[in-house]
């Protein structure tokens, strides 16, 4: 199911992107799932749809719920779901876990903290940054574009960082805040030629025709924060987005997991309603960083349906 969690605070702007991708020329219709009521596109409404985006200007606790988006093209429709939760503003300084975005790790060399979801908004610099509710002051902190840079990172810099910015919509300003944890890794990181943990090279994956199938491309790149690392799927040597088969989509799994201190990435290939022609394709799991690229190829084979016992 193409579903995405989104959250925000009451009286702040919240903008949600449809979890299904489509070309800018495709139309996107939004509905409130519980009532199947269409979300208006007129900007005079407090909640309105704008193409791939659903805008709450500002958000209210009552807006919480599941919203459906349908990406319509001349040849297909794709449905996605946005699970939106709007919380009451906290009176104290503590930011609860459910309002936290993904934790980022930094080191002496790399100490960028990106402001989560900011690319969805129409904002102008500078960003305001707070750590544990205190406004950041001093020359060690530099707000640069959509991220915060901390010079000479120390273990004491670990904590919860909140970015605050103003979203402008037709001349009206709305406040937005987003918080994420920052951890400091003191050990020296290193980078290796990519190692693909899954799938195995030339793996044959059994699938059932008409059912859904998932393939996971998982690779590790070294220890600590990696400067440039990526995993992706290709079909017959073509990018998924260029292949033009809406049933087949790739979706990022865990962003950067540090199991055993290793920096690893996952990319899941989701094949809906497996067809015979899918068995003829080569599925390439590619892992790359500055050192180079490694490829593991998977093919699909038909699984014989298990015989029911009566």
């Amino acid at each position: 199911k193409f579903s995405k969690q989104s959250w925000g605070l009451e009286n702040e702007a919240l903008i949600v992107r449809c979890p299904r991708q489509g070309k800018p020329s495709y139309t996107v219709d939004w509905y409130y799932s519980q009532t199947n009521k269409s979300i208006p596109t007129q900007e005079r409404n407090r909640v309105f749809a704008s193409g791939q985006l659903l805008k709450f200007l500002p958000a209210a606790v009552a807006d919480s719920g599941i919203y459906t988006c349908i990406v319509r093209s001349p040849t297909f429709n794709r449905t996605g779901y946005a699970n939106v939760t709007i919380y009451k503003k906290q009176s104290d300084c503590n930011v609860p876990d459910y309002l936290m975005y993904s934790t980022v790790s930094g080191s002496e060399k790399n100490s960028k903290i990106y402001c989560p979801t900011i690319d969805l908004y129409n904002w102008t610099a500078p960003l305001e940054w707070f750590k544990n509710c205190q406004a950041l002051q001093g020359s060690r902190y530099r707000a640069h574009k959509s991220f915060l840079v901390i010079d000479n990172v120390m273990t004491e810099d670990a904590g919860d960082y909140t970015c605050k910015f103003i979203h402008n919509e037709n001349g009206a300003n709305y406040s937005v805040t987003a918080t994420r944890s920052f951890t400091v890794k003191d050990e020296q990181g290193f980078s290796l030629f990519p190692v693909i943990g899954a799938p195995a090279q030339n793996e044959i994956k059994e699938v059932e025709i008409g059912k859904n199938a998932n393939l996971t491309c998982s690779a590790c790149f070294g220890k600590g924060t990696q400067f440039l690392a990526a995993v992706l799927w290709q079909l017959n040597g073509t990018k998924i987005t260029d292949f033009g088969e809406p049933r087949i989509q790739q979706e990022e799994g865990q962003n950067q997991s540090f199991s055993n201190g290793l920096a690893c990435l996952d990319m899941v290939l989701r094949i809906a309603d497996v067809k015979e022609e899918d068995l003829l394709l080569q599925y390439d799991c590619l892992a790359l960083n500055l050192h180079g690229l490694r490829r593991h190829t998977v093919r699909l084979s038909r699984k014989n349906p298990s015989k029911e016992c009566f």
Epitope: F193, G237, L286, L288, G292, H296
Partner: nanobody, 119 residues
């Protein structure tokens, strides 16, 4: 390979490599060089399906590897050339399970073209 020649330091050259006789799609194409009395070294590589590029640190920012899939051709644009870039440049191709500026990933090699940079 083609496009080699003599050039003054700071000048530019563009090398071409037309591939045939193997599956160009999903391959790794690379450029290597060997100066007299020195080991062969990797310069740049490109994964033909998607155009991901990899460079040796000594040329990063000065050399650019690119491709024309319609012509099964790979190029090496060399700018800000230095006398130490003087060498015979070889084009190479590999199956694509690995792609980097490492000679062991390549099993097809061109004849080489000479590049001379004078100060």
């Amino acid at each position: 390979e083609s496009g080699g020649g003599s050039v003054q330091a700071g000048g530019s050259l563009r090398l071409s490599c037309a591939a045939s006789g193997f599956t160009y799609r999903r391959a790794c194409m690379g450029w290597f060089r060997q100066a007299p009395g020195k080991e062969r070294e990797g310069v740049a590589a490109i994964y033909t399906s998607g155009g991901m590029t990899f460079y040796d640190a000594s040329v990063r920012g000065r050399f650019t590897i690119s491709q024309d899939n319609a012509k099964n051709t790979v190029y090496l644009q060399m700018n800000s050339l230095k006398p130490e870039d003087t060498a015979t440049y070889y084009c190479a191709a590999g199956g694509g399970d690995y792609c980097a500026t490492n000679a062991r990933f390549f099993n097809y090699w061109g004849q080489g073209t000479q590049v001379t940079v004078s100060s």
